[in-house]
Amino acid sequence: IWELKKDVYVVELDWYPDAPGEMVVLTCDTPEEDGITWTLDQSSEVLGSGKTLTIQVKEFGDAGQYTCHKGGEVLSHSLLLLHKKEDGIWSTDILKDQKEPKNKTFLRCEAKNYSGRFTCWWLTTISTDLTFSVKSSRGSSDPQGVTCGAATLSAERVRGDNKEYEYSVECQEDSACPAAEESLPIEVMVDAVHKLKYENYTSSFFIRDIIKPDPPKNLQLKPLKNSRQVEVSWEYPDTWSTPHSYFSLTFCVQVQGKSKREKKDRVFTDKTSATVICRKNASISVRAQDRYYSSSWSEWASVPCS
Amino acid sequence: RAVPGGSSPAWTQCQQLSQKLCTLAWSAHPLVGHMDLREEGDEETTNDVPHIQCGDGCDPQGLRDNSQFCLQRIHQGLIFYEKLLGSDIFTGEPSLLPDSPVGQLHASLLGLSQLLQPEGHHWETQQIPSLSPSQPWQRLLLRFKILRSLQAFVAVAARVFAHGAATLSP
């Protein structure tokens, strides 16, 4: 058993049929010694008396808010949560496996630049009695500070018969060094509590591996005289790290016909303009990627050829 | 060329070669997801690689103030990786074909380090740890770790030379 926060405790249980469970000793936080009784949740049934209560925790029915009283007055509470371990593996019932970029990916994180700011998100089908708490650091043995905000519900989607809820959190490294080569990964830890079930999820990454620039901005077309060619120009996204002579992007320009089956013409360039042939009913799209490190491409910025 | 005394390197040449290094490093190990190398044991194996750290003066301001600190750090790293890529880690099994980008990567690391430090000038170099894994799986794991680490190192070096070519070239 360990303390998650004040008066909230997590009991770690091996979860299998007829498992013996864990013996837990609760101590009433009071100077009083006599006349103390214990109850669980809303029940008035007295579970025991005395300053300590010893219980055998085997299942969710044994978890909940234990309260010690004296003469009708509440002295203190202890909330017991269960953390299940099945076949040596901690349960992951609360969050959905996003399966990208690999199986058992519950947390996904992205950064728009090298400033040390990043966003993580996760999915669940649970709509009520759900709380999250997020901690982060750079490195684990001698951790350096990363400050995370509160997790918030950021999207709701309908998937078949199910509703899916997306939560996200923003974090900022306290002393970020954008130009340095990271040697210690960022660690992100999410505590999830659903009713009386506790689970924790972790992710470890370098900022450089989760970079995804915003799409290029101010995408414009300039027709070239007496030609089917156009000059496409764009600018670095505002959110990208500066100076651009140091934090450079590379770009992919695509001409795509109306039909998905039409052949796509693609040009790669380090410049912020390119000359392409604009076909009728086609659109021109541009996306960006770090020039020197192959992290994710941005989403496309698009304009119609007409 | 950068010499210990402090003259400027051939920024544009260094920029071109460092960008080529980035491309080659990703050709040699394009995958990110097929093996989470930080989950595998063996941490000490790549903890000794020289990293370009915050105080090394490789940020835009540091380069403007005095690029020599940064260039020396980059040179150190280039020599370190050049030695690793020429070692048994990359010559043993699993077999690399002669068309492997590792060969070109090895030659380009040497080329860039020579651009930074011509014959006759000597910056101190970091000792390369004596790693001689006997098993193919250990060797492959080390290769992947070294190449992932090299990708990060040459990305910073390429940014330095691109910025230098754009703002510090005579």
Partner: antibody, heavy 120, light 107 residues
Framework: QVQLVQSGAEVKKPGSSVKVSCKAS????????IHWMRQAPGQGLEWIGY????????KYNENFKGKVTITADDSTSTAYMELSSLRSEDTAVYYC?????????????WGQGTLVTVSS | DIQMTQSPSSLSASVGDRVTITCKAS??????VAWYQQKPGKVPKLLIY???TRHTGVPSRFSGSGSRTDFTLTISSLQPEDVADYFC?????????FGSGTKLEIK
Amino acid sequence: QVQLVQSGAEVKKPGSSVKVSCKASGYTFTDQTIHWMRQAPGQGLEWIGYIYPRDDSPKYNENFKGKVTITADDSTSTAYMELSSLRSEDTAVYYCAIPDRSGYAWFIYWGQGTLVTVSS
Amino acid sequence: DIQMTQSPSSLSASVGDRVTITCKASRDVAIAVAWYQQKPGKVPKLLIYWASTRHTGVPSRFSGSGSRTDFTLTISSLQPEDVADYFCHQYSSYPFTFGSGTKLEIK
């Protein structure tokens, strides 16, 4: 896109020789090794060897040394595999293939195969 | 030479079944193993490399696992178009060698 086009089927007498060609297109011919494999009827694959056109250096499976000669002609972007002293057990489909660009020998692109039949 | 012992040599399964093919290397090959699919009269097609990485365009029902000497190709839900021969291949050591193949049929 990368393509490997092999020469047509051959029927040969025991003791004779055969030369199979593999014309490559869609990439720089001298940049990559070209490998040869064979597959006897109803059998698995056997790796014969490769040539690296950049330095004209072949490497052979020891089991095929003296039996096979692999060459390349940069001017036509074509690799050749010559089999000598043919015997009936050399009857097989012969494939050329090129590996991944990362320098390890898993094969992404294959020729369509050339059936060599050795029969008296 | 490294022997790649592949089993079973043939198997028959129903559409939707989970199918597993194994390959045992005679010595450590790290994860330098690829899997190919060869349909009748066609050339081999790469499915998996580095023991578990799916090649571009290969359906997600195909997966690979294993390291050092023991490797597995799994088809999570067999489809009619999966009828083919399957080969493992080690590219760790010269000469590169292949398994003898598994002929997969639909019941």
